[in-house]
Amino acid sequence: NWVNVISDLKKIEDLIQSMHIDATLYTESDVHPSCKVTAMKCFLLELQVISLESGDASIHDTVENLIILANNSLSSNGNVTESGCKECEELEEKNIKEFLQSFVHIVQMFINTS
């Protein structure tokens, strides 16, 4: 599932590049392992912002699929309460390219621990 998430992120990156969307998104670029689920939540919430702002059906479908995949992959620990983690709004705002790169990095963290 996580491998499919990465391929979806690559697809979103390609779609966004062709549309020239200029947005800044809350980005966790240095995820602590004890905050990875919280960070994943922030990434997914921001992805929905991309979907809504783009108004593009392909991006919408891909983001929706990515959320479905992430939910299923996290079904065992998605409701774990992590303490001492940053709120999404406390994160640094970065451009879409940097956001997606950081997203891939956190997904790889999940792959490495699964």
Partner: antibody, heavy 122, light 112 residues
């Protein structure tokens, strides 16, 4: 008023195939994910398949995975369910349903068709 | 798979009286973004199912306000404040947080 008309049901032998159709009208079909849900005679509801708005993503339970294929033709406002290797336990009324977006709405099936009966028997 | 368990399976109610249906999931159905994709559907005799409630407590358009949904995590409830004759049918809870999406067994509401 949103309209969904399922068709294509009938009697088929075990191991056989059938293709169901669902004609959609009175809404922009390509803006919605769609699902199939079935109901065996006298039984409860069972989710069968879901397809994304553009048709790139499909989801199934293990009970039909590899045997059923959901697809859509947005130019014809039509949803399909190709059913292969049919079994007696696939006998049911099959409903098509429109799905609200997870991102903009509630990810619910807000409108349902009237259903078409599939009977698998020798 | 997430198992949805409803109770009671049969619910005889006097007209004008309240009714309550419980639905319990085998695990939390809160998704990663904090949403809970729990719906309630009504199926009147001989008819197709109809959406009543989505995301636990949101009433779908055209649904009378005597229907209400509540709950969180793994425990959910559908309440009808005053049962009317047209409410007869089977009520299903449904989770679509995790694939495969799953329905409860259904609760048959009938008039005493």
């Amino acid at each position: 008023e949103v309209r969904l008309m399922a068709s294509g049901g009938g009697l088929v032998q075990p191991g056989g195939s059938l293709r169901l159709s669902c004609a959609a009208s009175e809404f922009t079909f390509s803006n919605y994910a769609m699902s199939w849900v079935r109901q065996a005679p006298g039984k409860g509801l069972e989710w069968v398949a879901t397809i994304s708005r553009g048709g790139d993503y499909t989801y199934y339970p293990d009970s039909v995975k590899g045997r059923f294929t959901i697809s859509r033709d947005n130019s014809k406002n039509t949803l399909y369910l190709q059913m292969n290797s049919l079994r007696a336990e696939d006998t049911a009324v099959y409903y098509c349903a429109r799905r609200v977006s997870m991102i903009t709405g509630g990810w619910a099936m807000d409108y349902w068709g009237q259903g078409t009966l599939v009977t698998v028997s020798s | 798979d997430v198992v949805m368990t409803q109770s009671p399976l049969s619910l005889p109610v006097t007209l004008g009286q309240p009714a309550s249906i419980s639905c319990r999931s085998s695990q939390s159905i809160v998704d990663i973004t904090g949403n809970t994709y729990l719906e309630w559907y009504q199926q009147r005799p001989g008819q197709s199912p109809r959406l009543l409630i989505y995301k636990v407590f949101n009433r779908f358009s055209g649904v009378p306000d005597r229907f209400s949904g509540s709950g969180s995590g793994t425990d959910f409830t559908l309440k009808i404040s005053r049962v009317e004759a047209e409410d007869v049918g089977v009520y299903y809870c449904f989770q679509d947080t995790f694939v495969p999406y799953t329905f409860g067994q259904g609760t048959k509401l009938e008039i005493k």
